[in-house]
């Protein structure tokens, strides 16, 4: 007689990352009997929702359900029907929705309300949609990468199962770049965290962690570009903006109303004698870099040391995983290799930005022109943010690892979020009490 395979005793969870520029749905899977073990949860699917971020649906909230359908359908296909009702679904919205909430709490609530109603229509165990704080976003990103890197495991291994792994249990810092915000999170070396807002205390798997985190709202790559444009148009002599952050020959008309739509440009807002202006690319890395630096106020610091805008930042410590747009942009530019020095990255950026727009379009036919046109800015911004914003140096650059996935799971806040909300990170070594959600807030 043939042996029949026993049914797999597994569980699933779904997290939707409602970012400023798009929404992604992640499906996670783990063995039911090993819930409290470290490193057992893995991603089985990512479905990127076609279209913009949910905050863009503010004028047509009734269509959010249509927008989410394909990926929710995908989740129905991937997860066995018998598991649907017990599969939790969480939606976390990040900086795009934080910005919308700053403009209108009522509109942000309306968007979330429709999201909740839409997701409640599916056969899963919907657990709610909320705007997560920047602090949570940083913390969960840090938990995700360290969980996936096996840093919370107490067992010392003589072999390495994941890339970037050193046998020590020292955690990695987390660098996350989105469209509307950026987060930096790490365990400083014997350093007091001088501002309470930036301090997190965790007890995970029997070990205490004192973690520094900060989320810079408006310093995601898309909002940083809007800031830069709003700053630069102030001093333009007419409706032509010669911009070093775009390729030579690139032209784009921008509506002033679009420029001032976001709260991130309010500090630069002024009455202009025109309703539109034209960006004309000149493709000069050095000038682009200089223009970006003007977005970082480094003249004021009420602490022993700061990142920028008066925000405390302890001395950098250890290795860092740089993910989300840090990774996507650097991957596109072919600059994610561990062997590429900071000087080499700068050199490559100089060459890339100087390439004519027509040449770039021909070389990258399959890339959406809006995204393609912004890689020069984004790459330069990443260098500026890491070097001048966070004070990485040519030497410490080698401690930055640009990470897309670890063990098949995307680096980002979603896995950490789910692990926490499903109580899968115990405070003590298993078996003991799970970490309470309040630890993070």
């Amino acid at each position: 007689t043939q042996n029949k395979a026993l049914p797999e005793n597994v569980k699933y969870g779904i997290v939707l990352d409602a970012g400023s520029s798009h929404t992604s749905l992640y499906i996670y899977k783990w063995p039911a009997e090993k819930e409290n073990d470290t490193g057992v949860v893995h991603q089985v699917e990512e479905c990127r929702v076609k279209g913009p971020g949910i905050s863009k649906f503010v004028q047509k909230v009734n269509e959010i359900g249509i927008y989410l359908t394909d990926c929710m359908e995908r989740a129905r296909e991937v997860i066995p029907r018998s598991q649907h009702q017990e599969t939790p679904v969480y939606l976390g919205a990040t900086a795009g929705m934080r910005l919308l909430r700053m403009e209108s709490e009522e509109l942000a609530d309306r968007v979330l309300d429709v999201v909740e109603r839409s997701l409640s229509n599916y056969p899963f165990d919907f657990q709610g949609a909320r705007i997560i704080t920047g602090q949570e976003e940083g913390a969960y990103g840090w938990i995700t990468i360290n969980y996936l890197l096996g840093k919370f495991s107490q067992k010392t291994r003589w072999f390495s199962i994941v890339p970037y792994e050193t046998n020590n249990q020292e955690t990695f810092g987390a660098l996350d770049l989105g469209g509307a915000s950026t987060q930096v999170t790490f365990v400083p070396q014997n350093q007091t965290i001088e501002s309470p807002d930036n301090a997190l205390q965790f007890r995970l798997y029997g070990k205490d962690y004192n973690v520094y985190t900060h989320s810079f709202l408006c310093y995601g790559k898309d909002q940083a570009l809007w800031q830069k444009l709003a700053k630069d148009i102030q001093v333009a002599s007419n409706e032509i903006l010669r911009d070093p952050c775009f390729h030579p020959g690139y032209k784009k008309v921008v509506n002033v109303s679009d420029l001032y739509k976001t709260p991130c440009t309010k500090r630069f807002e002024m009455t202009l004698p025109f309703q539109q202006f034209e960006i004309q690319g000149i493709g000069n890395y050095q000038q682009c870099h200089q223009s970006i630096l003007e977005l970082f106020n480094t003249s004021y610091c009420p602490y022993s040391q700061c990142a920028f805008n008066g925000i405390f930042l302890p001395p950098l410590q250890g290795d860092f995983g740089a993910f989300s747009a840090f990774y996507f942009v650097m991957k596109f530019l072919n600059l994610t290799s561990e062997k590429v020095s900071q000087e080499k990255v700068t050199e490559m950026m100089k060459k890339f930005c100087a390439q004519p727009w027509e040449e770039i379009k021909t070389s990258y036919a399959g890339v959406k022109e809006k995204y393609l046109s912004e890689y020069c800015f984004s790459g330069t911004y990443i260098l500026s943010l890491l070097l001048q914003g966070y004070h990485f140096t040519a030497d410490s650059w080698e401690h930055i690892h640009f990470i897309g996935k670890i063990q098949g799971s995307d680096a980002g806040w979603t896995l950490g979020y789910m692990l926490n909300l499903t109580n899968m990170i115990p405070a003590e070594q298993p078996l003991s009490t799970p970490l309470s959600h309040s630890t993070y807030v």
Epitope: F57, Q59, E63, G65, D70, R117, S118, G366, K368
Partner: antibody, heavy 121, light 111 residues
Framework: QVQLVQSGAELVKPGASVKLSCAAS????????VHWVRQAPGKGLEWVGK????????KFDPKFQGRFTITADTSKNTAYLQLSSLRSEDTAVYYC??????????????WGQGTLVTVSS | DIVLTQSPASLSVSPGDRATISCRAS??????????MNWFQQKPGQAPKLLIY???NQGSGVPARFSGSGSGTDFTLTISSLEPEDFAVYYC?????????FGQGTKLEIK
């Protein structure tokens, strides 16, 4: 500014195969689904299938499954419909189409000009 | 497969008049609180054009005179005041489940 350009008309023999292409410009096919729809001469529209170029998941009308294949090459920003074991009743204009939400949450649709496939001995 | 039946098969209307086309599905095309019914317009020798998606939402650049309504199995496309360029063939399509199916079409002719 967005254009879908389909390959030229094809005259093929019964039982043969043909591969139609749909090249997009001004838009990345990864950002939406590519649908294929056909229309026999003087008849109505018939949905063939679709592909998500971002992850190559495809869906078909079951009656075409096995005979028709949809693929995409995101580096070329092009989708393909391969027709095999062709029969005279497959004679039709084959359209590729994109529809979905753009960056401003407007619902767009773009269509190719169509490729006439004639199956005849 | 979900079968869509359009009525009438053809319709003669004068410019400026109102035109109504119906589409009936063999089973409900509603799911998750959404009606997965789309409407397309096709002129001779041209590719189709999306007019209405999800029963009642207008496609980009579609004139306001085109509207869609209905849920479950019964849907309607209404053109409030016909313009000369509106004379064409109109198709309904369900996208609730694969295979996405079209109605047989309604030919709108000038009276």
């Amino acid at each position: 500014q967005v254009q879908l350009v389909q390959s030229g008309a094809e005259l093929v023999k019964p039982g043969a195969s043909v591969k139609l292409s749909c090249a997009a410009s001004g838009f990345s096919i990864k950002d939406t689904y590519v649908h294929w729809v056909r229309q026999a001469p003087g008849k109505g529209l018939e949905w063939v299938g679709k592909i998500d170029p971002a992850n190559v998941n495809t869906k078909f009308d079951p009656k075409f499954q096995g005979r028709f294949t949809i693929t995409a090459d995101t580096s070329k920003n092009t989708a393909y419909l391969q027709l095999s074991s062709l029969r005279s009743e497959d004679t039709a204009v084959y359209y590729c189409a994109l529809y979905g939400y753009d960056d401003d949450a407007y619902y767009f649709d773009y269509w190719g000009q169509g490729t006439l496939v004639t199956v005849s001995s | 497969d979900i079968v869509l039946t359009q009525s009438p098969a053809s319709l003669s209307v004068s410019p400026g008049d109102r035109a109504t086309i119906s589409c009936r599905a063999s089973e409900s095309v509603d799911n998750y609180g959404i009606s997965f019914m789309n409407w397309f317009q096709q002129k001779p020798g041209q590719a189709p054009k999306l007019l209405i998606y999800a029963a009642s939402n207008q496609g980009s650049g579609v004139p306001a005179r085109f509207s869609g309504s209905g849920s479950g199995t019964d849907f309607t496309l209404t053109i409030s005041s016909l313009e000369p360029e509106d004379f064409a063939v109109y198709y309904c399509q369900q996208s609730k489940e694969v295979p996405y199916t079209f109605g047989q079409g309604t030919k709108l002719e000038i009276k």
